[in-house]
Amino acid sequence: DAHKSEVAHRFKDLGEENFKALVLIAFAQYLQQCPFEDHVKLVNEVTEFAKTCVADESAENCDKSLHTLFGDKLCTVATLRETYGEMADCCAKQEPERNECFLQHKDDNPNLPRLVRPEVDVMCTAFHDNEETFLKKYLYEIARRHPYFYAPELLFFAKRYKAAFTECCQAADKAACLLPKLDELRDEGKASSAKQRLKCASLQKFGERAFKAWAVARLSQRFPKAEFAEVSKLVTDLTKVHTECCHGDLLECADDRADLAKYICENQDSISSKLKECCEKPLLEKSHCIAEVENDEMPADLPSLAADFVESKDVCKNYAEAKDVFLGMFLYEYARRHPDYSVVLLLRLAKTYETTLEKCCAAADPHECYAKVFDEFKPLVEEPQNLIKQNCELFEQLGEYKFQNALLVRYTKKVPQVSTPTLVEVSRNLGKVGSKCCKHPEAKRMPCAEDYLSVVLNQLCVLHEKTPVSDRVTKCCTESLVNRRPCFSALEVDETYVPKEFNAETFTFHADICTLSEKERQIKKQTALVELVKHKPKATKEQLKAVMDDFAAFVEKCCKADDKETCFAEEGKKLVAASQAALGL
């Protein structure tokens, strides 16, 4: 549909509240360093302009594209060059190059202070004093720290954030009510951000076809009763939504996501029997619910895949004449039969099938050549199964913290050039796969674990891309999206790495560690562990365990001491000396 004024169209579709929220998110995701007040001012100006266009679509500038309007507005920021440096050069470009330029300058790891949670009473007062500003600030702070956060989903988080304060600020024990809710929102928000970052990386680095293949596999697992044509339609629409959000077109994205939810609910009989509850909810909850809905039951008596994809005389002709359709059907049929497989495994199987057909179809006897193609799948299926089995056993034996430490050591030895904060963050998240997935029965373990690992390894890839330091990381991140995890799993100790010089300052601790939360204390210890491995990459597990046990005892002892600072200074020197001796430094 062509509209005279795109901005008026979106304002009317979304309503003023959502329009303003989405423009704020868009601006905060582009200009991540700008103060809150500046963004609010820009948003208000855009909103007032949109209202004039709603009143008269022929008014001056109302026919301009959203990129032109928003880009022009962002380029009015006076401090653009001093705050953002070369990003200011984007403003000299014309659309669509200007928007592409802004996108390229999005920073996955912006230099922003950590968000410190104020006292509950302080938060409740701020909420009551100015609810609108309080909620806008939430959107702003999340969006600028997570420049690829899925905007319509952030509206859903904001709605829950508001509900938590509305309920808990009236409760007898405000903290007991509010803090668990805020913790849950924080953890879910981080997970949501990381999942969306993978979708955007998939689209931007590997193209639309890679994303569509992922979507075909996932939706076929989720909606196994839906016809291929139905799944294809959903995939096309979902791809449009995510392409828009990843491209900064947040108004279009939110609008199209709402349309998709509406379509799914209107056609749930031909999609899934699990959608009924979701479809009774209001829009934001509905969209979220659909995105998280459990897999429908598989249809009974599905025929063998071999008939259409191995035995049929038309396999090669169908492949050659429309690879996208034929391989899409293969992926659909395989995925709907295998909710027990990870999406990335299904994509590997489809790639193997494609490679085999490409090799065999021009041969003298194509059928004889590809007849055993399904046998080639066996090792591909067994590899993640075995890996998950081994790692879940290790997790059950060690518990989450020590399992994270094992992964920290493993990954630091693989890619020791990567910065310590990145190794700690990524390994801690990799380690969470244990508590997240190992509790599941066999049939749910692989989709949980391997698809989660894809999300976490993507965090490593996007952080590493900003400042590349390891050819091995670059290789695993860029060669194949679906083989990232096997690529990292296959890395051995980097024998070319020259150990880091020993620096006593790295292992000097102070009394402030005693007041940290358990999580923060763990991070301090894990940071030290990474540094140890960087100094002594050939250290054995036993050596590292001994040093870390001594370190834990040292922290515990000094935190109980009367003069903590003196204890940390004196005992710290002894610990460093003992550790150096134990590791032969």
Partner: antibody, heavy 119, light 110 residues
């Protein structure tokens, strides 16, 4: 020595037909895909179609109907009907790299045969 | 419709120069099905690179292919006398029937 050798080109009137041959020596034709590609004077390369070892044929969208590819044990043929002035070109046969079926990787080419369509 | 755009259409360079030729495809090629050919006057094309970056055996390492999806590049790091020729890219798509070549880049002596 592995060789592809085209023949059958020449002058033909608009509306006429011509059959080009691609004689293959040094390799067993029953194991390879052979393509026909043409190049108008000073112009782009243009893929016409392919025949797989199994005899299955494929054509560029624009070539369907007027062009037919066939083979026997040592020769691949390109039958061209209803020829037009714009079909004037050098016609090449080329082998697809072994291990590929639909990719545009042609590692062995003939020397080409010139077809001129003119009244 | 498939469009394969090569640029520049011609380039004048000297021996030892670095030459870069680009090929843009709309839509994106299938699975990095992109090749580069070299053709000298009166001769058949010669396959240099396949799968966007793999060198055919016997092709000197000064030829380098890169890119993915829609944007591809052929780089000749240090032009030799025998490299003066016309270079074509070729793309494979979802349907074999859409196999398409670019219209060439002529590398001439300056």
């Amino acid at each position: 020595e592995v060789q592809l050798l085209e023949s059958g080109g020449g002058l033909v009137q608009p509306g006429g037909s011509l059959r080009l041959s691609c004689a293959v020596s040094g390799i067993d034709l029953s194991n390879y895909a052979i393509n026909w590609v043409r190049q108008a004077p000073g112009k782009c390369l243009e893929w016409i179609g392919a025949i797989w070892a199994s005899g299955t044929t494929f054509y560029a969208t624009w070539a369907k109907g007027r062009f037919t590819i066939s083979r026997d044990s040592t020769t691949v043929y390109l039958q061209m009907n209803s020829l037009r002035a714009e079909d004037t070109a050098v016609y090449y046969c080329a082998r697809t790299v072994p291990g590929y079926s639909t990719a545009p990787y042609f590692d062995l080419w003939g020397q080409g045969t010139l077809v001129t369509v003119s009244s | 419709d498939i469009v394969m755009t090569q640029s520049p259409s011609s380039v004048s360079a000297s021996v030892g120069d670095r030459v870069t030729i680009t090929c843009q495809s709309s839509p994106s090629v299938w699975s990095n099905f992109l090749s580069w050919y070299q053709q000298k006057p009166g001769k058949a094309p010669k396959l240099l690179i396949y799968e966007a970056s793999k060198l055919t055996s016997g092709v000197p390492s000064r030829f380098k292919g890169s890119g993915s999806g829609t944007d591809f590049t052929l780089t000749i790091s240090s032009l030799q006398p025998e490299d003066f020729a016309t270079y074509y890219c070729g793309g494979g798509y979802s349907s074999i029937s859409d196999t398409t070549f670019g219209c060439g880049t002529k590398v001439e002596i300056k």
